[in-house]
């Protein structure tokens, strides 16, 4: 089938990095500057992606592969192939219609991207707050209040007593 196809279609012989030039009797011509073809048999070359503004070049365009972009410092990629750059915020903030804003009380964000999320509600799991939450950190839940009351049996069994002279493993 491949041999038959190449007899019928001379363009199938054009390798990546070239295009089948109809204006030149279907000769394989190299892709012009700032364009590429990543597969053989192409009748046109694709325009190279340009990384501009907040986008910076991670990989230069070649005759056989497109350029790849990432974001300048202070921004991070969103979408497939870094199709968007979004401004970073500080931990404890989120990006709003007014730019970066501190998380409201009761919420936190431990990253430079994304939204502020509510603190964990320890009481829903029957636990108490061991460490208070901040704008940057979630609360840390500890044992349930009942576990902390005097005389209550501990959920975790006590560690076995060590014999004198034995060091722990």
């Amino acid at each position: 089938f491949e041999r038959t196809r190449s007899l019928q279609d001379p363009c199938s012989n054009c390798p990546a990095g070239t295009f089948c030039d109809n204006n030149r009797n279907q000769i394989c011509s190299p892709c012009p500057p700032n364009s590429f073809s990543s597969a053989g048999g192409q009748r046109t070359c694709d325009i190279c992606r340009q990384c501009k503004g907040v986008f910076r070049t991670r990989k230069e365009c070649s005759s056989t592969s497109n350029a790849e972009c990432d974001c300048t410092p202070g921004f991070h990629c969103l979408g497939a192939g870094c199709s968007m750059c979004e401004q970073d915020c500080k931990q404890g903030q989120e990006l709003t219609k007014k730019g970066c804003k501190d998380c409201c009380f009761g919420t936190f964000n431990d990253q430079k991207r994304g939204i502020c999320r509510p603190w964990t509600n320890c009481s829903l799991d029957g636990k108490s707050v061991l460490v208070n939450g901040t704008k940057e950190r979630d609360v840390v839940c500890g044992p349930s209040p009942a576990d902390l009351s005097p005389g209550a049996s501990s959920v975790t069994p006590p560690a076995p007593a060590r014999e004198p002279g034995h060091s722990p493993q």
């Epitope: 907040v54 968007m84 979004e86 401004q87 990006l95 007014k98």
Partner: nanobody, 122 residues
Framework: EVDLVESGGGLVQPGGSLRLSCAAS????????MSWARQAPGKGFEWVSG???????YYVDSVEGRFTISRDNAKNTVYLQMNSLKPEDTAVYYC????????????????WGQGTQVTVSS
């Protein structure tokens, strides 16, 4: 071919004013959201302001009340009126299309101008 050309930058004293212009060509300006960004010396880019095709405007907190973005669709131009300028406003200011229409977000298909320098100093 798409072209964005900024002008109006310069040296101004603290408290002074400047009006930046961005002349656009090569695309349907009236249907495009537009934005201004800036890059201070040794710092990263910062989203400053944006305007939707319908005229809704958005600003980063640090310039709200001092800067005003506007557009003239008949002239294919977007403006940034900057009043009460501060030394920390010193930066290269860039005009860009704003396909994402999200604060602080630009799309790979957005077009960017070459920038105009604004220096606020006494």
């Amino acid at each position: 071919e798409v072209d964005l050309v900024e002008s109006g930058g310069g040296l101004v004293q603290p408290g002074g004013s400047l009006r930046l212009s961005c002349a656009a060509s090569g695309f349907t300006f009236s249907r495009s959201a537009m934005s201004w960004a800036r890059q201070a010396p040794g710092k990263g880019f910062e989203w400053v302001s944006g305007i939707y095709s319908g005229g809704s405007t958005y600003y980063v907190d640090s310039v709200e009340g001092r800067f005003t973005i506007s557009r003239d669709n008949a002239k294919n131009t977007v403006y940034l009126q900057m009043n009460s300028l501060k030394p920390e406003d010193t930066a290269v200011y860039y005009c860009a299309t704003w396909g994402s229409q999200q604060i602080g977000v630009w799309h790979e298909d957005d077009y960017w101008g070459q920038g105009t320098q604004v220096t606020v100093s006494s």
